[in-house]
């Protein structure tokens, strides 16, 4: 249950996360399972531990083996195992099955291919994408953040897709590649003008000064997997990232849910340590897709403090 397979190619960066989770205040120790020898935390080492992460910069075939991570809370130790295999680079174009990440499916409306494990790395856009070892070119292919979007997907688009990016650690650059299969499926779905389920239009949300508050923007866009659908928050008509208030943040990543077969997204706006001036702002929940944009406005009002422990 608490063991995880990880793999990589020699001379590339590989970063592995401990399969056991914890709190930021917990310490994590890493060991070579066979020898029980502690893995150093100093970054000058080629292989070193950094909290929940074990870093091979770069990896070598001899690094293959089982690594133990122990997440130490004050009263309990949680043990996990990372089974790491480092392979020699192939001279030909074929990517063997043992180097493949999970297969993803796409359709005409949704053709996002996420680059596997990329969230573990310190990388900067753009990603490079290859299909069957050929660099992808043409307007149909768009590298966006950590995924590839293919317009007007056809059955011929099925195949093995490789993302390539650079991991930066203390000014040194390391290459990383990851490959996964993409299959194309027919989908009977439709898209609608966005319908915002929450918040209600002109809703007044009661908050307590000094406490944290969450606002959820939730909207549905049709049936089946949707292409180009998004929900987001604006403050006084400005994007959250441009507003410049670090206490107010959107939850990273949009949660996709299928309620009664409908494709819905939600985005949580987190306000830390609510202040008086937050009550003066206009909070707009925006839902948009190819059909257009819908906006619901929320305002905050002060709630009389009550015992929040009850």
């Amino acid at each position: 249950k608490f063991s995880k397979q990880s793999w990589g190619l020699e001379n590339e960066a590989l970063i592995v996360r401990c399969p056991r989770q914890g709190k930021p205040s917990y310490t994590v120790d890493w060991y070579y399972s066979q020898t029980n020898k502690s893995i150093p935390t100093q970054e000058r080492n080629r292989v070193f531990a950094s909290g929940q992460l074990l870093k091979f910069l770069p990896a070598a075939v001899a690094d293959s083996g089982i690594y133990t991570c122990i997440v130490r809370s004050p009263t309990f130790n949680r043990t996990g195992y990372a089974n790491v295999t480092i392979y020699k680079k192939q001279s030909d174009c074929n990517v063997p099955d043992y180097l493949m990440y999970s297969t993803v499916s796409g359709s005409e409306k949704n053709s996002k291919i996420y680059c596997p494990t990329i969230d573990l790395y310190n990388w900067t856009a753009p990603l490079e994408w290859f299909k069957n070892c050929q660099a992808l070119q043409g307007s149909r292919y768009r590298a966006h953040k950590s995924f590839l979007v293919i317009d007007n997907v056809m059955t011929e688009d099925a195949g093995d897709y490789t993302c390539k990016f650079i991991h930066n650690e203390n000014g040194a650059n390391y290459s990383v590649t990851a490959t996964r299969s993409f299959t194309v499926k027919d989908e009977q779905g439709f898209s609608l003008f966005p319908v915002i389920g929450a918040p209600a239009q002109n809703e007044i949300k009661e908050v307590e000064i000094g406490k944290n508050a969450n606002l959820t923007c939730s909207a549905c866009f049709g049936k089946g997997t949707q292409f180009l659908a998004a929900v987001l928050w604006q403050l006084n008509g400005t994007k959250i990232t441009d507003f410049g208030e670090p206490r107010i943040q959107q939850e990273e990543g949009q949660n996709q849910s299928f309620s009664n077969g409908l494709a819905c997204l939600d985005m949580v706006l987190r306000i830390a340590d609510v202040k008086e001036e937050d009550l003066l702002l206009q909070y707009d929940c925006l839902a948009l897709n190819l059909h257009g944009l819908r906006r619901h406005t929320v305002r905050l009002s002060r709630k009389n403090p009550i015992d929040h422990h009850s």
């Epitope: 056991r20 989770q21 914890g22 709190k23 930021p24 205040s25 310490t27 809370s73 004050p74 009263t75 309990f76 949680r78 929040h308 422990h309």
Partner: antibody, heavy 120, light 111 residues
Framework: QVTLKESGPTLVKPTQTLTLTCTFS??????????VGWIRQPPGKALEWLAH???????QYNPALKSRLTITKDTSKSQVVLTMTNMDPVDTATYYC????????????WGQGTTVTVSS | DIVLTQSPASLAVSPGQRATITCRAS??????????MQWYQQKPGQPPKLLIY???NVESGVPARFSGSGSGTDFTLTINPVEANDIANYFC?????????FGQGTKLEIK
């Protein structure tokens, strides 16, 4: 908004088993770092920690009571259940459930408590 | 078990004055440079309410009149200035070792 609410019998007979349910909202017990614990307080006395359960199903018990306690969670129902066997009149107390949140391990939100009397 | 001894058992303070409650642990409650000691306020008929966590951090929404200090084995809760609605029992609690333990409580009264 985080809330916790205890439910269970108000009166149990000696030797019987007490089952208490904590129903919570405003957080998920599948979130890394979260826990829910049980604490009791006999009338006019100090608080006594009984047990807690973590997001990854790690369970910790008060060694003095471990043989009598079982704690379980149902993440989908947002519930934590504590059972205590072989009840005795000295177990008469208000029983609280509380959340363990934050970056460190401590009870940050408490339920209102439920009073349990052990008497024949 | 880590035994927490609070003193005094009770104290009476005039409004506007300072109240100081101490908690001594039978062994250190330090973990990775952090003191795992909390303070709770409990009013009659109510559940405990978190005031201070990891020795000196004031919980969100708690008035700045409450402060905590200390490390290792000796900890202090200070209320300055005391107000009439601070009448309550105050408990310290450690989460360094299982079983988590509480102090026996200090009853604060207003003169």
């Amino acid at each position: 908004q985080v809330t916790l609410k205890e439910s269970g019998p108000t009166l149990v007979k000696p030797t019987q088993t007490l089952t208490l349910t904590c129903t919570f909202s405003g957080f998920s017990l599948s979130t890394s770092g979260m826990g829910v614990g049980w604490i009791r307080q006999p009338p006019g006395k100090a608080l006594e920690w009984l047990a807690h359960i973590w997001w990854d199903d790690v369970k910790q018990y008060n060694p003095a009571l471990k043989s009598r306690l079982t704690i379980t969670k149902d993440t989908s129902k947002s519930q934590v259940v504590l059972t205590m066997t072989n009840m005795d009149p000295v177990d008469t107390a208000t029983y609280y459930c509380a959340r363990i949140g934050g970056d460190y391990d401590y009870f940050d939100f408490w339920g209102q408590g439920t009073t349990v009397t052990v008497s024949s | 078990d880590i035994v927490l001894t609070q003193s005094p058992a009770s104290l009476a303070v005039s409004p506007g004055q300072r109240a100081t409650i101490t908690c001594r642990a039978s062994e250190s409650v330090e973990y990775s440079g952090t003191s795992l000691m909390q303070w709770y306020q409990q009013k009659p008929g109510q559940p405990p309410k978190l005031l201070i966590y990891v020795a000196s951090n004031v919980e969100s929404g708690v008035p700045a009149r409450f402060s905590g200090s200390g490390s290792g084995t000796d900890f202090t809760l200070t209320i300055n200035p005391v107000e009439a609605n601070d009448i309550a029992n105050y408990f310290c609690q450690q989460s360094r070792k299982v079983p988590w333990t509480f102090g026996q409580g200090t009853k604060l009264e207003i003169k």
